[in-house]
Interface confidence: low
């Protein structure tokens, strides 16, 4: 009865179970009777990250600077290169195949969460009592100025985009 299944880390060749090659190595020759599987190390710039029976190693990913990418972690014979975006940019997708500029929070919205290499800026509307008058990827909403603590009175109310305007206390007539 020919075999149809092999143990973990083995593969089937002509009804014979051969040992797979370990991560970082590719298959040169299948096992044959008493001769074990022949494997060889992946070359520089290549990798295999699993136990395998692959004839070819995979090329390391290229972190293309023209897409705003740079190498975060060098690949090895067992791992792929990981790319990340330059500062001021974030990945456009989960695979981080290219980068785009961080979004700015417009006036009236403040930064809730600063962007990272993998996530964009998260903005939040400024609540009552707070304002933002700039487009920024860093600035949170600022509290309105307290005229009273400065010994002044409110001349103009604040909005989510503008601060309160304070003025001097009106003089009392004798």
């Amino acid at each position: 009865e020919p075999r149809t299944a092999c143990r973990e880390k083995q593969y089937l060749v002509d009804s014979q179970c051969c040992n797979m090659c370990p991560p970082g190595e590719k298959l040169v020759n299948d096992c044959l009777h008493t001769i074990d599987t022949e494997c060889t190390r992946c070359q520089t710039g290549e990798f295999l990250d699993t136990w395998n029976a692959e004839r070819h190693c995979h090329q390391h990913k290229y972190c293309d600077p023209n897409l705003g990418l740079h190498v975060e972690k060098e690949g090895t014979s067992e791992t792929d290169t990981t790319c990340t975006c330059d500062e001021g940019l974030h990945c456009t997708n989960a695979a981080c195949e290219s980068c785009t500029m961080h979004s700015l929070c417009p006036p009236g919205l403040g930064v809730k969460q600063i962007a990272t290499g993998i996530s964009d800026t998260i903005c939040d509307p400024c609540p009552i009592g707070f304002f933002s008058n700039v487009s920024s990827a860093l600035e949170k909403c600022h509290p309105w100025t307290s005229c009273e603590t400065k010994g002044l009175v409110k001349v103009q109310a604040g909005t989510n985009k503008t601060d309160v305007i304070c003025g001097p206390q009106p003089r009392l007539r004798a």
């Epitope: 520089t44 710039g45 600077p65 023209n66 190498v71 001021g88 860093l138």
Partner: antibody, heavy 119, light 107 residues
Framework: QVQLQQSGPELVKPGASVKISCKAS????????IHWVKQSPGQGLEWIGW????????KYNEKFKGKATLTADTSSSTAYMQLSSLTSEDSAVYFC????????????WGQGTSVTVSS | DILLTQSPAILSVSPGERVSFSCRAS??????IHWFQQRTNGSPRVLIK???QSISGIPSRFSGSGSGTDFTLSINSVESEDIADYYC?????????FGSGTKLAIK
């Protein structure tokens, strides 16, 4: 036009610290990296690290961790590098240079600051 | 760290001659190489970025080529003002590294 103006030469004693500055003008300071590079007398160029003023994030060459500290003041568009526990090995000219966030080389350089460590 | 080997250490040429500088990386770095000129007591100045991309304001006699591990900077007709040290630098990964430089001298 883009300019990086560095502080003047420094003569410091062994064991002391020094802080050198690099004032940027002519571009948006928070949108570009500032890199620092060391050039020892008669020698080549050695990369120390960068700071991105827009976020304050830094990256150091392992060789200079604990030796150099990079900071930036966005209100004055000035980057700083502090060198600590100075020895004669730290005597060198230090350059600041600008690099864009992508597709760019170190495109503008300061004139260099000479640091001499001597007792 | 990626090692950049520049050769020769000194190049001596006559004005008007073509000259080539070599830079070899210890591993494949795509086209992430930049070339700088540094005159005596001056700051480095970028000549070529990403192996072959020209830089605004740099004379057209400067050109670059190569990818992977072998890179070349060429000056197609050397002028006396080109006397300087020439460095390659990689931006493929941190830490950025520079070559040891090649000094250009005029015969």
């Amino acid at each position: 036009q883009v300019q990086l103006q560095q502080s003047g030469p420094e003569l410091v004693k062994p064991g002391a610290s020094v802080k050198i500055s690099c004032k940027a003008s002519g571009y948006s300071f928070t949108s570009y990296y500032i890199h620092w590079v060391k050039q020892s007398p008669g020698q080549g160029l050695e990369w120390i690290g960068w700071i991105f003023p827009g976020s304050g994030n830094t990256k150091y060459n392992e060789k200079f961790k604990g030796k150099a500290t990079l900071t930036a003041d966005t209100s004055s568009s000035t980057a700083y590098m502090q060198l600590s526990s100075l020895t004669s090995e730290d005597s060198a000219v230090y350059f600041c240079a600008r690099r864009g966030t992508t597709r760019d080389a170190l495109d503008y350089w300061g004139q260099g600051t000479s640091v001499t460590v001597s007792s | 760290d990626i090692l950049l080997t520049q050769s020769p250490a000194i190049l001596s040429v006559s004005p008007g001659e073509r000259v080539s500088f070599s830079c070899r990386a210890s591993q494949s770095i795509g086209t992430s190489i930049h070339w700088f000129q540094q005159r005596t007591n001056g700051s480095p100045r970028v000549l070529i970025k990403y192996a072959s991309q020209s830089i605004s304001g740099i004379p057209s006699r400067f050109s670059g080529s190569g990818s992977g591990t072998d890179f070349t900077l060429s000056i197609n007709s050397v002028e006396s003002e080109d006397i300087a040290d020439y460095y390659c630098q990689q931006s493929y990964t941190w830490p950025f590294t520079f070559g040891s430089g090649t000094k250009l001298a005029i015969k």
